[in-house]
Interface confidence: medium
Amino acid sequence: YFGKLESKLSIIRNLNDQVLFIDQGNRPLFEDMTDSDCRDNAPRTIFIINMYKDSQPRGMAVAISVKCEKISTLSCENRIISFKEMNPPDNIKDTKSDIIFFQRSVPGHDNKMQFESSSYEGYFLACEKERDLYKLILKKKDELGDRSIMFTVQNED
């Protein structure tokens, strides 16, 4: 069971300082941006981190959404990352959800975060280069210190 607690506006970056944004095709991508680029591209660069309490204490549960024309929420259904047109619900009566991730700081790296899927244990949000695009994907954690699954989250409130 997950119960929504509060929401914060955030900018999410990978460790190469590229900014996460949602493109016109609703794809989550990373790109080099200056602070002014980041502002100019809002709201596509501003993510709503919806925080939930978890009835099984597994950490800080979050759903990540973005509000452009409509609200879309990040999903890892079938281990594929996509934004689905939906509001994060107030309550989720299940122990797993495709839209719920556990946000945890990386031990020894206070300001770096990782996001583990509640549906697929051991799978994390990651940044992966595919041709010329830096994509947000779901990746099985396979090594210690994997920088691709680490992010910084800048609070915009």
């Epitope: 929504k4 607690l5 509060e6 914060k8 506006l9 950490g59 800080m60 107030d90 700081s105």
Partner: antibody
Framework: QVQLLESGGGLVQPGGSLRLSCAAS????????IHWVRQAPGKGLEWVSV????????YYADSVKGRFTISRDNSKNTLYLQMNSLRAEDTAVYYC???????????WGQGTLVTVSS | DIQMTQSPSSLSASVGDRVTITCRAS??????LNWYQQKPGKAPKLLIY???TLQSGVPSRFSGSGSGTDFTLTISSLQPEDFATYYC?????????FGQGTKVEIK
Amino acid sequence: QVQLLESGGGLVQPGGSLRLSCAASGFTFSSYAIHWVRQAPGKGLEWVSVISGEGSNTYYADSVKGRFTISRDNSKNTLYLQMNSLRAEDTAVYYCARVMIGYGFDYWGQGTLVTVSS
Amino acid sequence: DIQMTQSPSSLSASVGDRVTITCRASQSIFNYLNWYQQKPGKAPKLLIYDSSTLQSGVPSRFSGSGSGTDFTLTISSLQPEDFATYYCLQYSGFLFTFGQGTKVEIK
């Protein structure tokens, strides 16, 4: 700047009721979960309750469940704690506190004293 | 519910001393633990969140460590203004729980 101001404390008899208020300013009230935390005289901190930013979810410590009700009016930027069936052990300073993204209680009110005594 | 056991309940130390306070959770809370300082008649002040992240404006002599069930707050060189009561708080579960507190007094 962020401010939280509690009111409504006072002396009440065992079995009585009291409603505490917490007026908030300096931030987008509806975006934040707000907590009540209490401290009995000379004792430690005890978490009491929290309400979600939109007001749809509430959680309570076992010691107050069924007797206390947390609520909020986002149009008035105000948090409430309705306390019924009060007991002597509810005597405490009651603080409202705002959380930050890591759930750190980063802003606190100055507290309001509730005394339950006959 | 998750219980937090904080120790010691009080300690006496001198300015310049290294002070260590521990908190133990009844089950794993990952790194979801905060440390607070409280002075008499005042509201608590957040020192450290997520077990080891120093809150902005807090002196670097304060540090936190630990993950899972065992956590430590360390003051590397105690200063006169550090004499106070310290609390841990877990926020992993549905309910939040404070430790019992540690009063740091002047020796």
